[in-house]
Amino acid sequence: KSPIFGPEEVNSVEGNSVSITCYYPPTSVNRHTRKYWCRQGARGGCITLISSEGYVSSKYAGRANLTNFPENGTFVVNIAQLSQDDSGRYKCGLGINSRGLSFDVSLEVSQGPGLLNDTKVYTVDLGRTVTINCPFKTENAQKRKSLYKQIGLYPVLVIDSSGYVNPNYTGRIRLDIQGTGQLLFSVVINQLRLSDAGQYLCQAGDDSNSNKKNADLQVLKPEPELVYEDLRGSVTFHCALGPEVANVAKFLCRQSSGENCDVVVNTLGKRAPAFEGRILLNPQDKDGSFSVVITGLRKEDAGRYLCGAHSDGQLQEGSPIQAWQLFVNEESTIPRSPTVVKGVAGGSVAVLCPYNRKESKSIKYWCLWEGAQNGRCPLLVDSEGWVKAQYEGRLSLLEEPGNGTFTVILNQLTSRDAGFYWCLTNGDTLWRTTVEIKIIEGEPNLKVPGNVTAVLGETLKVPCHFPCKFSSYEKYWCKWNNTGCQALPSQDEGPSKAFVNCDENSRLVSLTLNLVTRADEGWYWCGVKQGHFYGETAAVYVAVEERKAAGSRDVSLAKADAAPDEKVLDSGFREIENKAIQDPRLFAEEKAVADTRDQADGSRASVDSGSSEEQGGSSR
């Protein structure tokens, strides 16, 4: 008996798609061996049509795929644009076609519905609109027009020209009689329900000379589109419901048990708590289409999703819908990275962001998720040297450590920095990840003075006190600018006196600026790192003023003033800030990046669109 299992019989109609799931024992050998789908010949051979090693027969080109799900021991064969020629006996299997690890599948493709004995067939999707056209002769032009539905043996009146409407159709049906030139009336039914399907008869006149026309209405449930995404990655659901619902509330819901569909997000402002911080509903286009982006995919996100339109913002009978079956691949290419990073007020965090290592030259971005309305994610910093004005001097995006990870450092933390942030690039949109920054009780580990004033032409020494917990770390000073933080020479001044209960391993490391010039004004950071991995940082603003008295300045912690609240930007920086993002590929699918910058604060365009692994802000 073969351990492979699947459907013995598959039936479909021409033009449709099938999705055949084959199950295998998920041993490590089975998980990684070749998977195939082959057609059995009359003489017993089995000709491969598609395999997991990339082979696709010319018969299947552009209309089939095979996806392996090693973690649950299944592979799925999708075949689209079926024709009657596809009917036959197949095998799905593992290894080599001629060996026994396979399962026999019979596929039967029948002819699609057509015109039957003068019956016009209308095939319409659930929730959409159908127009049933009913011709009549001149002698019946002034007579009653009506539409009946065949229920069992009896025709039941649905609507007529005297104003009757069957209660099942109230508010969603009308009868239109064309102008005198056209001998035609039509019945328009909106918000089609599954129960509307069936045989209809339209009639003009009531006597033996009446004109009759049969109609067969087929209401289709949407075939769910299969979507396969990696754990920790991102998925985008594009929902195009048509211009007729452009002004109706939109929703995305996830089917739970049975008929229930729990709202994930809708345009009325509802959002499921499980998706807080990791979902965006993009503003809709004029044609009513919209998209929903979900990042930080979890195992429990797998399931069936429906998008639709209804004034209630949730699934109701007659809602036009689109469906997806989301599979979350646990053997993910996206590496684990902390989903929660903690920092203290006044301290800092260093966030590691994964990206597709094949796209090392892509532009990297970091944005702050905002939950208001449908969610948005205004950009804060990018790898091309742009930083949002309010974050000047305390935010930096570094390409290190590279090879699939970049680093974002944020310091001078306040409680307002708590929230969800997204890491993303202008390349692979599946690699958007989410991190939550939490501000916890505690003191910053690094101690530096507040704002410092240097005197032109003199020497300035700025101290940074490192506690003993960082004894094994590399300590550095750097000057912040919008492209990063350029390392500067610093001096180890021996043990620090700034820490109670801290031994000789604490350190005082000073930055010395000789012969200060105007160019030395700006933000300076001291910090710790291990190789290319960054830890805590602390920021000091150095102002430069005219000489008042000779000598050098040595700043101590006691002399420190509070850091300035605001800085006036120089014109060059403001120009960079107000420059529109030129790269058209960035979030092209969400149409999110446009020159919609708020000129007042220089804010960048925004991406409109758990059980946490935690990382402290102070170490790695």
Partner: nanobody, 126 residues
């Protein structure tokens, strides 16, 4: 909420036939899967067959021991899933349950189903 009700069970001689039916009521959207399982006294519930559908496509699954003897189908008009059982054997005796789910899961597993009927007893005498 979805309710499932099985019917058609009874006593039959070996070699005979029975037609069970699983009627579903309640609202459903999108695809659906219905599975037939049986449970002999003192034994675990075991898979017999299943049918799932999505749009105009239907998929039928059978346990090896019933292949060629049992046929699962779907009656759209009545919203039922009949199980036609021919050439019945004494080892086919048990309570037959139908289960329903809207998820795409392994149809052989009882854990794949969200809804269950109360069961109908089939006794095959020798």
């Amino acid at each position: 909420e979805v309710q499932l009700v099985e019917s058609g069970g009874g006593l039959v001689q070996a070699g005979g036939s029975l037609r069970l039916s699983c009627a579903a009521s309640g609202r459903t959207f999108g695809s659906y899967s219905m599975g037939w399982f049986r449970q002999a006294p003192g034994k675990e519930r075991e898979f017999v067959g299943a049918i799932s559908w999505s749009g105009s496509s239907t998929y039928k699954y059978y346990e090896d021991s019933v292949k060629g003897r049992f046929t699962i189908s779907r009656d759209n008009a009545k919203n039922t899933v009949p199980l036609q059982m021919n050439s019945l054997k004494p080892e086919d005796t048990g309570v037959y349950f139908c289960g329903g789910t809207m998820e795409r899961r392994d149809p052989r597993r009882t854990s794949a189903y969200d809804y269950w009927g109360q069961g109908t007893l089939v006794t095959v005498s020798s």
